[in-house]
Amino acid sequence: ASNFDCCLRYTDRILHPKFIVGFTQQLANETCDINAVIFHTKKGLSVCANPKQTWVKLIVRRLSKKINKM
């Protein structure tokens, strides 16, 4: 759920890493209310996820490793 470029709340679903092509991080500031990881899926969707959740951290770590290898 996002308002323009800001995530307003987190998904209540768990996504598989195979579904995700990349991510961006949203930091809470004067523009956006919450910290979030925005996953970009193979279907072109942007999914707002809670950066504190284990499954989110795992995917971010996996994607970051991939990026660092390139």
């Epitope: 768990i14 579904f19 193979k42 284990t54 499954w55 795992l58």
Partner: antibody, heavy 120, light 107 residues
Framework: QVQLQQPGAELVKPGASVKMSCKAS????????MHWVKQRPGQGLEWIGV????????TYNQKFKGKATLTVDTSSSTAYMQLSSLTSEDSAVYYC?????????????WGQGTSVTVSS | DIQMTQSPASLSASVGETVTITCGAS??????LNWYQRKQGKSPQLLIY???NLADGMSSRFSGSGSGRQYSLKISSLHPDDVATYYC?????????FGGGTKLEIK
């Protein structure tokens, strides 16, 4: 070795609640998810929901929201599922199963299942 | 939710034969598919994960293939011990959904 121990059976009255347990051993409890799966007699498998024991994060199949509540006690490495307002539709075998994101999010170990019978 | 459709619902084959079970998803699940084997009176067991990877302790007579929306499980040189119900499962996104199952019997 990895083991998930579940009580064999529960007999409960319609309208009542039941809380079933799943005691994990042989691995670090907080490093793996715990899923719950329902199987009615002669029918297929239905995913109820999952809990992450490291932070108690849960997500449910919409169909079971309000019916099932998943919790954990990390001190005893035990997962629990409470089912409320029971009807005959809830008579089934309920499995706890370890979710392993290291092997493609698969459920790699299963408990023996708790058979729940709802009857007056 | 992603729907999983398995076929056939049941099949009977002779010892030594090769059988194939198929599983179709209602949308692309990008290989996020697992197979389970459930023998009579027992709990399900992980058989194949990630569409193609054999789970620890399972016979190499089992193999998984497929991509996109279509997947299959092949059992070669059928053994009497293979009598079971086989389920596919989508793990792309919750809620995780199972196929209806394929009951395998020996002729």
């Amino acid at each position: 070795q990895v083991q998930l121990q579940q009580p064999g059976a529960e007999l409960v009255k319609p309208g009542a609640s039941v809380k079933m347990s799943c005691k994990a051993s042989g691995y670090t409890f907080t490093n793996y998810w715990m899923h719950w799966v329902k199987q009615r007699p002669g029918q297929g498998l239905e995913w109820i929901g999952v809990i992450d024991p490291s932070d108690s994060y849960t997500t449910y199949n919409q169909k079971f929201k309000g019916k099932a509540t998943l919790t954990v006690d990390t001190s005893s490495s035990t997962a629990y599922m409470q089912l409320s307002s029971l009807t005959s539709e809830d008579s089934a075998v309920y499995y706890c199963t370890r979710g392993n994101y290291g092997v493609d999010y698969a459920m790699d170990y299963w408990g023996q299942g708790t058979s729940v019978t709802v009857s007056s | 939710d992603i729907q999983m459709t398995q076929s056939p619902a049941s099949l009977s084959a002779s010892v030594g034969e090769t059988v194939t079970i198929t599983c179709g998803a209602s949308e692309n699940i990008y290989g996020a598919l697992n197979w389970y084997q459930r023998k009579q009176g027992k709990s399900p067991q992980l058989l194949i994960y990630g569409a193609t990877n054999l789970a620890d302790g399972m016979s190499s007579r089992f193999s998984g293939s497929g991509s996109g929306r279509q997947y299959s499980l092949k059992i070669s040189s059928l053994h009497p011990d293979d009598v079971a119900t086989y389920y596919c499962q989508n793990v792309l996104i919750t809620p995780y959904t199972f196929g209806g199952g394929t009951k395998l019997e020996i002729k």
